[in-house]
């Protein structure tokens, strides 16, 4: 779970160790604040749960790619 200390800075201290199916993901945001111990990705699932993930992992990178392509493609 992301942890908001002195909002609005949200940090991740631990990453999920489970790969999440891309079908369960709705969006993501990058955590890059130098106030945080590490850069991270926070995925938001289709049930609005937020999950911290390691941006160095290939499945995380692939999921971000998928979401970015999906966001830009107009939904018909």
């Amino acid at each position: 779970q992301p942890d908001a200390i002195n909002a609005p800075v949200t940090c991740c201290y631990n990453f999920t160790n489970r790969k999440i199916s891309v079908q369960r993901l709705a969006s993501y945001r990058r955590i890059t604040s130098s106030k945080c111990p590490k850069e991270a990705v926070i995925f938001k699932t289709i049930v609005a749960k937020e999950i911290c993930a390691d941006p160095k992992q290939k499945w995380v990178q692939d999921s971000m790619d998928h979401l970015d392509k999906q966001t830009q493609t107009p939904k018909t």
């Epitope: 990058r30 890059t32 130098s34 111990p37 850069e39 941006p55 160095k56 970015d68 966001t71 830009q72």
Partner: antibody, heavy 117, light 107 residues
Amino acid sequence: QVQLVQSGAEVKKPGSSVKVSCKASGLTISHTYMHWVRQAPGQGLEWMGRIDPENHNTKFDPKFQGRVTITADTSTSTAYMELSSLRSEDTAVYYCARGVFGFFEHWGQGTTVTVSS
Amino acid sequence: DIQMTQSPSSLSASVGDRVTITCKAFEDIYNRRAWYQQKPGKAPKLLIHGATSLEHGVPSRFSGSGSGTDYTLTISSLQPEDFATYYCQQFWSAPYTFGGGTKVEIK
């Protein structure tokens, strides 16, 4: 706060090599990627490559492949960039920068490398 | 490599002016672009990354927009400290590439 401090200016002969260091403070380099970007006098920015200090995995612009070596020492939080077979066109300011996503949140102050006979 | 074409290469403007810099990628980069500001003798400074993410401490007069291959940096009201060179960069795929830069000068 995050700081990247680079080694001093270098003057090199054509054909020789140069090794530039970048010491990080305020962050654990194994949590990020360390990149090298250069800028020739009066010119734009050119990405050279990056290292994941956690596993020493590297990625380079094919233009520099074989001529550049990027290493990192997590025990001293230092990244290094070595460029070999120097030519006059390599005269530039060399920057280290950090960022896991492919953009660069923090930069070193730059190291001027002059290649001249 | 994904080529990034930035325009104009230079512009003259006055304090208070609205300034727009454009960047065109030679293929879709899905909003994965960053904007940097660089002053003479200094390292570049990250302003914006991704769709709209303004870096911490960057004034709200800076904004980014665009999608697909076309992106824009807007400075809504130019301040004296904004005279500098601006670069766009794509981070959709390595090798990461930069635009040629736009030098914003005092009119």
